[in-house]
Interface confidence: medium
């Protein structure tokens, strides 16, 4: 069986807004659901369609869906079908319409002391209640000779005199919502003793300290009286005069005069004009002090030729709005053209280099006037001045390449190096121009390098190879002091490059030949067995052709190299006790005994009262506590060589001798006891 | 006549997922009925938490559907509530209920449980 | 969502006398979407009046509901003992539906 697990209900909807009505269905098989409004099938629109098995109202329309809906769910295969239970719309709307004159049935009727009644032709549902109004002053019951229900759409003036003229509007809500008249009634019943309005004040904008004019002109049998008054109702007459518009001055056809205006002058003008009979007529006008506020900056703007470009300015704020107009050259631009004015933006079409320069965009009022320039480049692409030559730089000295371009706005030169962008560093520097220098030329930097020249309007570029002139120099130097190990073979190695390899010998620094156990093999000095007296000043002279020579200066020592006469051993030492790591080594020259302990070197002059290194390099610490536990390293060096070894020092609780024990049982671990 | 009855536990810590089942008797949770969740703070109104219908369609509460799910199993004849991110705000009675069959008002309601968020 | 209010928070009557209980919604109520419920303390609530105005199984004649677009009535005509309790109304007419915060019925 076909179920509705959601039903369809009646509701309240309102004009032009947004309604659903629901509709959920269940069945064994598949179902299609379709809509009935009084019993004939809904067609979909765009405002009012199916969404799901629900029916959607983008807008509820109070004549399209007006009626009964019902959601039908229809079994294609077995025509089973079920229907939902009916809903409608209870739909709120409210239609604004004309105030007209209901009696008489003419203007031309309209006499003093007659009855006339109009009517407020706004409908609606649910029906509104209406409010009547004179001159848009709400009119309540039961005043000044006239009726008026707020069920009541029917306004009646009985009888109708001078007093009720004025134009009638009303306005009617709703539940829904609220309208007004969409056209008013001007009832105009003559009473030559009430003041009519000849001439109206008019709200003024001046500028400071200029004059400013209110005209205000009544008439009626016999001639009414005329007031002005300001904001704060004071009257201003030609005898009394309020402290702040001591300046004014009101002239016999009603006129008011006020010069020299100052701030404290801006405000609400009001002229009252007052018949022998009938009410009061005011009439307000605004007196405003123009104004206009500085205008921002803009910023300098760069263009590219043959493109079309905007520059829109923001007029200043004032009072009154302030014109705007461009300018170029002390001329003002025209609305049309390639170079004009459209709105308040310049524009500029298809750009020539001669567009470039200062333009100003000018805005004024009565307040003043203010301008505010945009500077204008027209970018062009970069030219040469000079390119970058393939060059050959000497090692170790400034190398510098050249870019030299020129161009609108000034271009931005970027180096590559080997295709990689050069960034700069110690080494590398581009100066303003575009030139590249090389700090310290290094033999690695012979490549390839290109230059790239740019502004908005396009780039160029160029590239040129860098050969590298090697210098004359030792590779690596030799080390000033060498040691060789007395009784020994020994080599001495000694190498150098340079634009043309270079010779390498040895000689000795007193100018004396070599001894012939000694030989000068390609640069490296060769020592078969070495003795006391090959100590001494050798000198290696490295030379070519177009360099000349170079020296370096070795001083080779003959040494015993170091060995350990006595090494630290593993020592177990109780706390409190005194340990003793020995070590001893010898070589030539004779060699230094250094302590590290716990990872830092232990200095014999900052040692305190518990440690002592001894002549002979052994070291003694007092009074043994945990803390002292760990590795100890003993360090041999002399001027040729240094050697270390290390042993682990372990500090332990004296064991309590237990019985089984007799006085001479020894430790289960080497020991120094003291 | 229709029963509900809720079960979960009544101690749920801050920022953990409160998890309740609502067991359905007397009927069959597959009747054209939607079932939804319920909760009412001591001492204050009630709050629509969702509801599901037995094919496994639901419709959640905008102000907590990021946090919620229901969920249903024929099987057992019962549908569960889980509510993620728990704060000391959702301490409430939580009473599962029965819609009427098309409409969005409660004919049937469980005598709920109190869940409270507490470290 | 539409939000209900229900005045007043607290309703002080003698057993016997009539008790109007007000509900409010935030925007139009089709008057097919509204319910009332009563909840008696430690209790879940228990449905009275659903449709603005039909009594659910079970209902004493004695309550009555009433109302249309945003402005519903609860009436009970003679309150019995057991009537002094907790009122809740619900609109169910727009998703998420909504209930009031409730009237309390005092014994005087």
């Known amino acids: 069986a076909i179920v509705f697990i959601k039903q369809p209900s009646s509701q309240d909807a309102l004009q032009g807004r947004r309604a659903l009505l629901r509709c959920e269905v269940e069945a064994p098989g598949p179902v299609h659901v379709y809509w009935l409004l009084d019993g004939a099938p809904v067609q979909d629109t765009e405002r009012r369609f199916a969404q799901g098995s629900s029916l959607s109202f983008a807008a509820v329309d109070r004549l399209q869906d007006s009626g009964t809906f019902q959601c039908v769910a229809r079994d294609d295969v077995t025509g089973e079908e079920a229907r939902s239970a009916n809903a409608s719309f209870n739909i709120k709307w409210i239609e604004a319409g004309p105030v007209v004159l209901k009696h008489p049935a003419s203007e031309a009727e309209i006499q003093p002391q007659t009855q006339v009644t109009l009517r407020c032709h706004i409908d609606g549902h649910p029906r509104p209640t209406y409010q009547w109004f004179r001159d848009g002053t709400p009119l309540s019951d039961g005043q000044s000779n006239h009726t008026v229900s707020s069920k009541e759409r029917n306004l009646t003036l009985r009888p109708a005199g001078p007093e009720h003229s004025g134009l009638y509007s009303c306005c009617a809500h709703s539940a829904f919502g609220q309208a007004c008249s969409s056209q008013n009634f001007t009832l105009s019943i003559a009473d030559e003793s009430f003041a009519r309005v000849v001439l109206a004040p008019q709200d003024v904008v001046v500028a400071r300290y200029e004059e400013a004019m209110f005209h205000c002109q009544f008439s009626a049998q016999p001639p009414p009286s005329l007031q002005w008054l300001f904001e704060d109702e004071t009257p201003i007459t030609n005898r009394s005069r309020p402290p702040h518009l001591r300046r004014a001055t009101v002239f016999a056809n009603g006129s008011l005069l006020l010069t020299q205006v100052r701030p404290r002058n801006a405000g609400i003008y009001r002229c009252i004009g007052q018949g022998q009979r009938g009410p009061p007529i005011i009439l307000e006008a605004t007196l405003h002090l123009a104004e206009i506020e500085d205008m921002p900056l803009f910023e300098p703007r760069v263009f590219t030729a043959g493109s079309e470009e905007r520059v829109t300015c923001l007029p200043p704020k004032g009072l009154p709005e302030p014109s705007v107009w461009w300018e170029h050259a002390g001329v003002r631009l025209p609305t049309h053209g390639r170079v004009y004015q459209k709105g308040h933006e310049l524009v500029l079409a298809n750009i020539a280099e001669s567009d470039a320069g200062v333009y100003t965009c000018h805005a004024a009022n009565l307040a003043g006037q203010r301008r505010q320039d945009v500077n204008i480049t027209v970018a062009t692409v970069p030219s040469w001045l000079k390119k970058p030559q393939d060059s050959q730089l000497e090692e170790g000295k400034p190398g510098y390449l050249d870019c030299l371009t020129q161009a609108t706005p000034k271009p931005t030169v970027v180096w590559y190096r080997n295709q990689m962008l050069i960034s700069e560093d110690s080494r590398f520097e581009v100066f303003k121009n575009g030139t590249l220098r090389i700090n310290s030329v290094e033999v690695y930097d012979g490549t390839w390098y290109r230059c790239m020249s740019s502004t908005p309007a396009g780039s160029i570029e160029a590239q040129a190879r860098v050969q590298v002139l090697e210098k004359l120099k030792f590779t690596p130097p030799p080390q000033p002091q060498q040691c060789m190990e007395f009784d020994k073979e020994a080599t001495v190695p000694c190498s150098a490059t340079g634009r043309e390899k270079p010779t390498i010998k040895w000689e000795r620094a007193d100018g004396s030949s070599l001894p012939e156990w000694v030989t000068d093999n390609a640069g490296t000095l060769h020592f078969a067995r070495v003795t006391r007296d090959d100590a001494g000043n050798y000198t290696c002279i490295a030379s070519n052709g177009p360099q000349g020579q170079i020296r370096a200066h070795v001083q080779l020592t003959v040494a015993v190299f170091i060995t350990f006469k006595v090494e630290p051993e593993r020592t177990t030492v109780y706390q409190g006790h005194t340990a003793l790591l020995q070590c001893e080594a010898q070589g030539d020259p004779k060699p230094l005994i250094q302590w590290k302990g716990k990872d830092r070197i232990l200095d014999p002059t900052k040692l305190g009262p518990r440690m002592h290194i001894f002549q002979n390099g052994s070291l003694v610490i007092h009074d043994v506590a945990p803390e002292d536990s760990g590795r100890y390293t003993c360090i041999a060096g002399n001027s040729c060589n240094i050697k270390h070894t290390e042993a682990p020092l372990y500090v332990v609780d004296k064991p309590v001798p237990e019985e089984s024990e007799g006085p001479g049982s020894p430790p289960p671990y080497k020991m120094i006891q003291t | 006549q229709v029963q509900l009855q809720e079960s979960g536990p009544g101690l749920v810590k801050p920022s953990g997922t409160l998890s309740l089942t609502c067991a359905v008797s007397?009927?069959?949770?597959?009747?054209?009925?939607?079932w939804s969740w319920v909760r009412q703070p001591p001492g204050k109104g009630l709050e629509w938490i969702g509801e599901i219908y037995h094919s496994g369609s639901t419709n959640y509460n905008p102000s907590l559907k990021s946090r919620v799910t229901i969920s249903v199993d024929k099987s057992k004849n019962q549908f569960s509530l889980k509510l993620s991110s728990m704060t000391a705000a959702d301490t409430a009675v939580y009473y599962c209920?029965?819609?009427?069959?098309?409409?969005?008002?409660?004919?049937?309601w469980g005598q709920g449980t109190l869940v409270t968020v507490s470290s | 969502e539409i939000v209900v209010t229900q005045s007043p928070a607290t309703l002080s009557l003698s057993p016997g006398e009539r008790a109007t209980l007000s509900c409010r919604a935030s925007?139009?109520?089709?008057?097919?979407?509204l319910a009332w419920y009563q909840q008696k303390p430690g209790q879940a609530p228990r449905l009275l009046i659903y449709g603005t105005s039909s009594r659910a199984t079970g209902i004493p004649d004695r309550f009555s509901g009433s109302g249309s677009g945003t402005d519903f009535t609860l009436i009970i005509t003679r309150l019995e003992p057991e009537d002094f309790v907790v009122y809740y109304c619900?609109?169910?007419?727009?998703?998420?539906?909504?209930f009031g915060q409730g009237t309390k019925v005092e014994i005087k």
């Open positions: 619900q609109q169910y007419g727009t998703s998420p539906r909504t």
């Open positions: 007397g009927g069959s949770i597959s009747s054209i009925n939607w």
């Open positions: 925007q139009s109520v089709s008057s097919s979407y």
């Open positions: 209920a029965r819609d009427e069959s098309g409409y969005d008002y409660f004919d049937y």
